[in-house]
């Protein structure tokens, strides 16, 4: 009987998760005489196969990061190999799984900030990439400061924009940073995928060395 997994030759789209071991057929095309066999062409990548009887399947796990959409064509052939139906487009959309970890572009960043700089104004950006689909949580990155050294009175002088990786001073940092007292700081920054919301997220860390420079601007005397 015709149904979800079998039917006549017509344009179709299928969505398959990447990374899954091939476990079932994609579709069973039905031949109408004089068609006796089927032919598959297009972006098969030697993964997609159609058997003589019209059984379309894949023989190894897909990888969205290699190809996110496979554009295939299926034709029905007669007993002389001549196309009697089609070719029709068959689109395989490869759905993303979280199979890639975010990675900082640099293992170490260096920057400088002037004392009394405006809080919230970025003076340095850290940047990570993730090969997973940015339209899904798998590729949505979340930055945070893990450690600030030194940490004086348990006060954070630096903050990071969780989405953009922009580092700036906190209000306390703007008021209290003094190169005469502490000319340099080190931050350990982490990035997580899944928007930072899952225990199953992947993460990476990087080190940021920050030099505090003196504010040479003096208020004019009255």
């Amino acid at each position: 009987q015709e149904g979800k997994f079998s039917g006549p030759l017509k344009p179709m789209t299928f969505s398959i998760y990447e990374g899954q071991e091939p476990s079932q057929i994609i579709f069973q095309f039905k031949a109408n005489p004089p068609a006796v066999t089927f032919e598959l062409t297009g972006e098969t990548d030697n993964i997609f196969v159609i058997e003589r009887e019209g059984l379309l399947y894949y023989n190894r796990a897909l990888d969205r990061e290699t190809r996110s959409t496979h554009n295939l064509q299926v034709a029905a052939l007669d007993a002389n190999g001549i196309i009697v139906e089609g070719p029709v487009p068959i689109t395989i959309k490869v759905k993303d799984i979280n199979d890639n970890r975010p990675t900082f572009l640099q293992s170490k960043y260096e920057g400088s900030v002037r004392q009394n700089s405006r809080p919230g104004k970025p003076f340095l950006y850290v940047n990570a990439t993730d090969l997973d689909d940015p339209a899904t949580p798998n590729g949505q990155l979340y930055y945070q400061i893990v450690i600030q050294l030194p940490m004086i009175n348990n006060v954070m002088y630096f903050q990071i924009n969780n989405k953009t990786g922009a580092i700036s001073l906190t209000r306390e940092g703007s008021q209290e940073l003094n190169p005469a007292k502490n000319p340099s700081y080190n931050l350990v920054i982490s990035v997580k995928d899944m928007g930072g919301q899952s225990e199953n997220s992947f993460s990476d860390t990087t080190s940021v060395d920050i030099i505090v420079t003196e504010n040479i601007w003096k208020a004019p005397k009255p």
Partner: antibody
């Protein structure tokens, strides 16, 4: 080895019919199509049509479709081509040929049957 | 119908010399699967046709490797690297991309 053996020469009068046979051996008869091609004296080759012995499906050249019938007898692995309403310009050598499934080419031809149409 | 045009129609060749036969189709015989549906065969005097080349460039089983086929979607060439006496006969190209199958007029190869 694979062979196609055709019936002997025929002499026919205009308006009559002729039925040429082609006996296959050395392979599974129902696996491959049998085609008929003719060659008039001093002329080129002309494809007449084919039959698929597995299901009896036929396709004919439009030029012959009203006058030709192709059949098979799978019990004897024999293909037949009947041409009706013969005219003098049907005088030709008629060949059967096996079209190799999956490789898609004529790999074996019969020896040919001469059909002469003359009053 | 697809028209197949061969040239030359007659080809006198000295044994041991190369020979080349051209065939042109009125429509591309290249299909999206990458195959070109052109077939070359030889009809020796008084004999049935015999296959030489299938799908433009594939040498059929038992055919000497002095025969080769090449071409594009519409222009095809059959080459014989060194002609031998046994190669005489009429050479035909044929398309089987679509029905009706159609043939070239034939090229008669003869020994000088």
């Amino acid at each position: 080895q694979v062979q196609l053996v055709q019936s002997g020469a025929e002499v026919k009068k205009p308006g009559a019919s002729v039925k040429v046979s082609c006996k296959a051996s050395g392979y599974t008869f129902t696996d491959h199509t049998i085609h008929w091609v003719r060659q008039a004296p001093g002329q080129g080759l002309e494809w007449m049509g084919y039959i698929y012995p597995r299901d009896g499906y036929t396709k004919y050249n439009e030029k012959f479709k009203d006058r030709v019938t192709m059949t098979t007898d799978t019990s004897t692995s024999t293909a037949y081509m009947e041409l009706r309403s013969l005219r003098s310009d049907d005088t030709a050598v008629y060949y059967c040929a096996r079209f190799y499934y999956g490789y898609w080419y004529f790999d074996v031809w019969g020896q040919g049957t001469t059909v002469t149409v003359s009053s | 119908d697809i028209v197949m045009t061969q040239s030359p129609l007659s080809l006198p060749v000295t044994p041991g010399e190369p020979a080349s036969i051209s065939c042109r189709s009125s429509k591309s015989l290249l299909r999206s699967n990458g195959n070109t549906y052109l077939y070359w065969f030889l009809q020796k005097p008084g004999q049935s046709p015999q296959v030489l080349i299938y799908r433009m460039s594939n040498l059929a089983s038992g055919v000497p490797d002095r025969f080769s086929g090449s071409g594009s979607g519409t222009d095809f060439t059959l080459k014989i690297s060194r002609v031998e006496a046994e190669d005489v006969g009429v050479y035909y190209c044929m398309q089987h991309l679509e029905y009706p199958f159609t043939f070239g007029q034939g090229t008669k190869l003869e020994i000088k």
